[in-house]
Interface confidence: low
């Protein structure tokens, strides 16, 4: 006769492991008992259980409640056992020794491999600001057994670097994603992808990139200078910029206070019916937590009674 078993049994942490051992004997041969033991090199064999043909399953105190026979129907030549709720410490070599008559004893070994799926974590780097050089955007760490694979899925251009730390029964892998921040990266997803044989599918953690910036400021509303004449209604100046975080706007007049009746509504400066009193230099001040910008314009309200042309100067400063 001969023993049938597996070279390797692989389970995920917490699953039940079936340790197979089947004696394929000749006609008339019988199995008296099957003994299961840990057989790791350098350690003495530690018995898990003994399946006796007459007296049933005996379990070592160290494995009480964790070793069972497979559910019926059972073949009397089947010495397989179930190891419940596999933990990392169960990983290693196991030996099944089958005592038969009249053929004698047979033994076989298998290796139990316990996969420990990783629990990845993603840590964003420092605040990203436009104008920085190569900067850490995020790091992703996953620990498991065997070592997991950590990669990145993103449309953003960047560089990755990985390092691994081996522990006694597992390995931790950390991957970092570096980039040169630019405003076009705002809102872009950066996804850490962790692969591992103990996972049914890759684990993904997504981080949304936020890059602080402030665009140059400019003022709209003076494109047609002929519209800025005494009596005109609905005249307005609009300050244009964009940023992350979204900027706030403030209007001032360089050569004095804002004239009465002039309304400030965020990025827009609204004028009452124009008079020559509204002529002057207006400054839009744009700011966010990252930076601030100024843009100033000169308004010259034309009085048709004075036959003089309107001068318009645009100046942008930051």
């Amino acid at each position: 006769g001969e023993l049938e078993t597996s070279d390797v049994v692989t389970v995920v942490l917490g699953q039940d492991a079936k340790l197979p051992c089947f004696y394929r004997g000749d006609s008339g041969e019988q199995v008296g008992q099957v003994a299961w033991a840990r057989a790791d090199a350098g350690e003495g064999a530690q018995e898990l259980a003994l399946l006796h043909s007459k007296y049933g399953l005996h379990v070592s105190p160290a494995y009480e409640g964790r070793v069972e026979q497979p559910p019926p129907p059972r073949n009397p030549l089947d010495g397989s056992v179930l190891l419940r709720n596999a933990v990392q410490a169960d990983e290693g070599e196991y030996e099944c020794r089958v005592s038969t008559f009249p053929a004698g004893s047979f033994q076989a070994r298998l290796r139990l491999r316990v996969l420990v799926p990783p629990l990845p974590s993603l840590n964003p780097g420092p605040a990203l600001e436009e104008g920085q050089g190569l900067t850490l955007a995020a790091s992703c760490t996953a620990e498991g057994s065997p070592a997991p694979s950590v990669t990145w899925d993103t449309e953003v251009k960047g560089t990755t670097s990985s390092r691994s730390f081996k522990h006694s029964r597992s390995a931790a892998v950390t991957s970092e994603f570096h980039l040169v921040p630019s405003r076009s990266m705002n809102g872009q997803p950066l996804t850490c992808v962790v692969s591992h044989p103990g996972l049914l599918q890759d684990q993904r953690i997504t981080h949304i990139l936020h890059v602080s910036f402030l665009a140059e400021a400019s003022v709209r509303g003076l494109e047609d200078q002929n519209l800025w004449h005494v009596g005109r209604e609905g005249a307005m100046l609009k300050c244009l910029s964009e940023g992350q975080p979204p900027p706030s706007y403030n209007w001032t007049r360089l050569d004095g206070p804002l004239p009465s009746g002039v309304r400030v509504d965020g990025d827009t400066l609204g004028f009452p019916p124009l008079t020559t009193e509204h002529s002057g230099i207006y400054v839009c001040h744009v700011s966010n937590e990252f930076s601030s910008r100024d843009s100033q314009v000169t308004v010259d309200v034309l009085d048709p009674q004075e036959d003089s042309g309107k001068q318009v100067d645009l100046v942008s400063a930051s």
């Epitope: 078993t5 070279d7 491999r113 065997p146 044989p197």
Partner: nanobody, 118 residues
């Protein structure tokens, strides 16, 4: 480090046969299991069969009775005889070796394409 080189892939009609071979070199003394994996388009890589140094074998249910793995420990080769091929056997086949130091398949061949036409 173990190097693995496969050969023998190709195009075959359904019901036909192919034989894949894999030669190992390098740190062969550390090899424990050797096996064949396959990966079809848009699918996970799966273990087809593996064999121990002593000749104990294991097969995926989908190939039992059709595929046979053999190993020549002296020559450091492992072969896969594939009979009664089906279109669903179409995949890239990879030879793999398991190191007794790491306890998982950590050496891989470059892969060989097997295409089974109906």
């Amino acid at each position: 480090e173990v190097q693995l080189v496969e050969s023998g892939g190709g195009l075959v009609q359904a019901g036909g046969s192919l034989r894949l071979s894999c030669a190992a070199s390098g740190s062969i003394s550390s090899i424990n299991l050797m096996g064949w994996f396959r990966q079809a388009p848009a699918k996970q890589r799966e273990l087809v069969t593996s064999i121990s140094p002593g000749g104990s074998v294991r097969y995926a249910d989908s190939v039992k009775g059709r595929f046979t793995i053999s190993r020549d420990v002296a020559k450091n080769t492992v072969d896969l005889q594939m009979n009664s091929l089906k279109p669903e056997d179409t995949a890239v086949y990879y030879c793999a070796a398991e190191s007794e130091r790491t306890y998982y398949f950590d050496s891989w061949g470059q892969g060989t394409q097997v295409t089974v036409s109906s």
